[in-house]
Interface confidence: medium
């Protein structure tokens, strides 16, 4: 056997090149036939009336033909024949790749609540072979479940992703990425997650700066509440007691002028939105005026309905009047 061919893989719409090569030429006739065994070229003559076939090279050792605007119907075995005695035949297989026509991502709901599991679907339509779909949340790869539908040698792939959302996922893209031999580079589509979550509440002491609260001093606390949607209600209450008469509430701020021992207690900032409610507590201890040496601690405790972490701010009075603040996780 001294007649050789090579298999051809081509993307739909592009050009396929078919080559019949003879190793030891003796000027025998070379012929190329299509999958229906119709003659495309006999020597340099084209009996088949399909102008998409063009002669690239004809000699005693090679018949090279191009097929332009390849379609899926062109797929199959093409036969090279060499009229020696006995005749020789070799075939080349043309495989046509079809990139996905359309890539669609569909998210079950536009807005999800933290902790909720949502379904995201991605469909790559009418490709050949079937597309591989990969999922990413940000740059983290996730595993979906794919189903393949075949119709007339073409494949539609639908991949389903079940995703449990967290507040950190708000604004993060969910990306459906396609891998296909007919696609170079990244073919992808994405949707951004919108996650609603209950408030996170944090109390900050804005005055006194050194953190030590003494009789006669003023106290200013600021309540920061972050949630989605942004909390509409931020309220200050005194736990198990009435708010002091001389306390002033201004939005997220609590002012208490001229502190005295009767102000000792727990002050709570509460915030809520449509998802839920959370609070943070500040334990106020009013120390004697500077003439006496103070006990060592003023504490702030942060609690929410979602976490067991308690943040305690400890004022360390070993450095004299200047207290240093340490954050301690319990």
């Amino acid at each position: 056997q001294n007649l050789f061919t090579k298999d051809v893989t081509v993307i739909e719409g592009e050009v396929a090149t078919i080559s019949c090569q003879v190793n030891k030429s003796d000027d025998s006739v070379i012929q190329l036939l299509n999958p229906n065994r119709q003659t495309i070229y006999f020597r340099d003559f084209r009996p088949l009336k399909d102008s998409r076939f063009q002669l690239l090279n004809f000699s005693s050792s090679e018949l090279k033909v191009s097929l332009t605007n390849v379609s899926i119907s062109d797929e199959g075995r093409y036969f090279c024949q060499l009229y020696t005695d006995p005749p020789q035949e070799s075939y080349t297989t043309i495989t046509v790749l079809v990139p996905p026509r359309n890539l669609m991502i569909d998210i079950q709901k536009d807005t999800a609540v933290e902790g909720e599991e949502i379904e995201v679907n991605c469909t790559a339509m009418a490709s050949k072979p079937a597309t591989t779909i990969r999922w990413f949340k940000g740059n983290t790869e996730l595993k979906g479940k794919s189903e393949v539908e075949e119709w007339s040698d073409m494949y539609t792939v639908t991949s389903q992703l079940m995703l449990k959302v967290h507040k950190e996922d708000d604004g993060v893209p969910v990306i459906c990425q396609v891998e296909h031999p007919a696609v170079t580079g990244n073919l992808q589509t994405q949707r951004y997650l919108e996650v609603q979550y209950k408030p996170q509440v944090h109390i900050q002491m804005t005055y006194p700066l050194q953190g030590l609260t003494r009789e006669g001093d003023a106290l200013e606390l600021t309540c920061e509440a972050i949630g989605k949607p942004q909390p509409v209600m931020v309220t200050w209450v005194r736990v198990d007691d009435e708010m002091p008469q001389h306390a002033v509430l201004s939005g997220p701020n609590l002012f208490i002028n001229n502190l005295n021992k009767t102000d000792n207690g727990t002050y709570r900032c509460e915030a809520s939105n449509i998802v839920g409610k959370a609070h943070s507590d500040y334990m106020l201890y009013v120390y004697d005026p500077p003439t006496t040496i103070p006990p060592p601690t003023t504490t702030t405790t942060t609690t929410t309905t979602t976490t067991t972490t308690i943040l305690t701010i400890i004022t360390d009075s070993r450095a004299g009047e200047e207290g240093s603040i340490r954050a301690v996780d319990h």
Epitope: W135, F136, N139, T140, E141, K143, K145, S146, M162, L163
Partner: antibody, heavy 125, light 107 residues
Framework: QITLKESGPTLVKPTQTLTLTCTFS??????????VGWIRQPPGKALEWLAL???????RYSPSLKSRLTITKDTSKNQVVLTMTNMDPVDTATYYC?????????????????WGQGTLVTVSS | DIQMTQSPSSLSASVGDRVTITCRAS??????LAWYQQKPEKAPKSLIY???SLQSGVPSRFSGSGSGTDFTLTISNLQPEDFATYYC?????????FGGGTKVEIK
């Protein structure tokens, strides 16, 4: 208790195909979320991930070796088979199979626990 | 591919020491990192997953921390059985990749 054991030839000639079998117990490869991976370690060198097969027959391969690797599963026999074509002396290594651990079924990320004892494959003529 | 770089490649320590091994990813991997311990002629054993979660049955002297690109494995009170090679592995995305290993030897 999950256990895995690798079996296959200890000596392979260059250009030959290596076929390794991982036989496991304590879990089923038809259970959602389950997967089995293959990792190798050349003598005195680091670990290298090769391939992984999921319960739903989804297969993932190391890109640098993808053209040479095939991973398959036989759920009824509790076995996973790895074949590696065109073996070369640089493929001499201990080959491990391992059970895929995962926090959530949907997460593609994997770590492995436990591992099989490993099988040393030497490629030499 | 995400490259995982471990340091140091080897270290000498004594029983009772506190040992720290670091692992750096070439790009952010969130908290998708596992740590393994491997003793000579044995298979690796999982210690830590999700950067800081202790695998069941692993002593509490092992701890992991970090997120993004920089991670740490700490052994707080080194025991004789802890002398081994330690590997990190990212599972943020394919291909799964391992660090080059850190060998902990007796001083």
């Amino acid at each position: 208790q999950i256990t895995l054991k690798e079996s296959g030839p200890t000596l392979v000639k260059p250009t030959q195909t290596l076929t390794l079998t991982c036989t496991f117990s304590g879990f089923s490869l038809s259970t959602s979320g389950v997967g089995v991976g293959w990792i190798r370690q050349p003598p005195g060198k680091a670990l290298e991930w090769l391939a992984l097969i999921y319960w739903d027959d989804d297969k993932r391969y190391s890109p640098s070796l993808k053209s040479r690797l095939t991973i398959t599963k036989d759920t009824s026999k509790n076995q996973v088979v790895l074949t590696m074509t065109n073996m070369d002396p640089v493929d001499t290594a201990t080959y491990y199979c391992a059970h895929r651990r995962v926090e959530w079924v949907t997460l593609a990320g994997n770590w492995f626990d436990p591992w099989g004892q490993g099988t040393l494959v030497t490629v030499s003529s | 591919d995400i490259q995982m770089t471990q340091s140091p490649s080897s270290l000498s320590a004594s029983v009772g020491d506190r040992v720290t091994i670091t692992c750096r990813a070439s790009q952010g991997i969130s908290s998708w990192l596992a740590w393994y311990q491997q003793k000579p002629e044995k298979a690796p054993k999982s210690l830590i997953y999700a950067a800081s979660s202790l695998q069941s049955g692993v002593p509490s002297r092992f701890s992991g921390s970090g997120s993004g690109t920089d991670f740490t494995l700490t052994i707080s009170n080194l025991q004789p059985e802890d002398f081994a090679t330690y590997y990190c592995q990212q599972y943020n995305s394919y291909p799964l990749t391992f660090g080059g290993g850190t060998k902990v030897e007796i001083k």
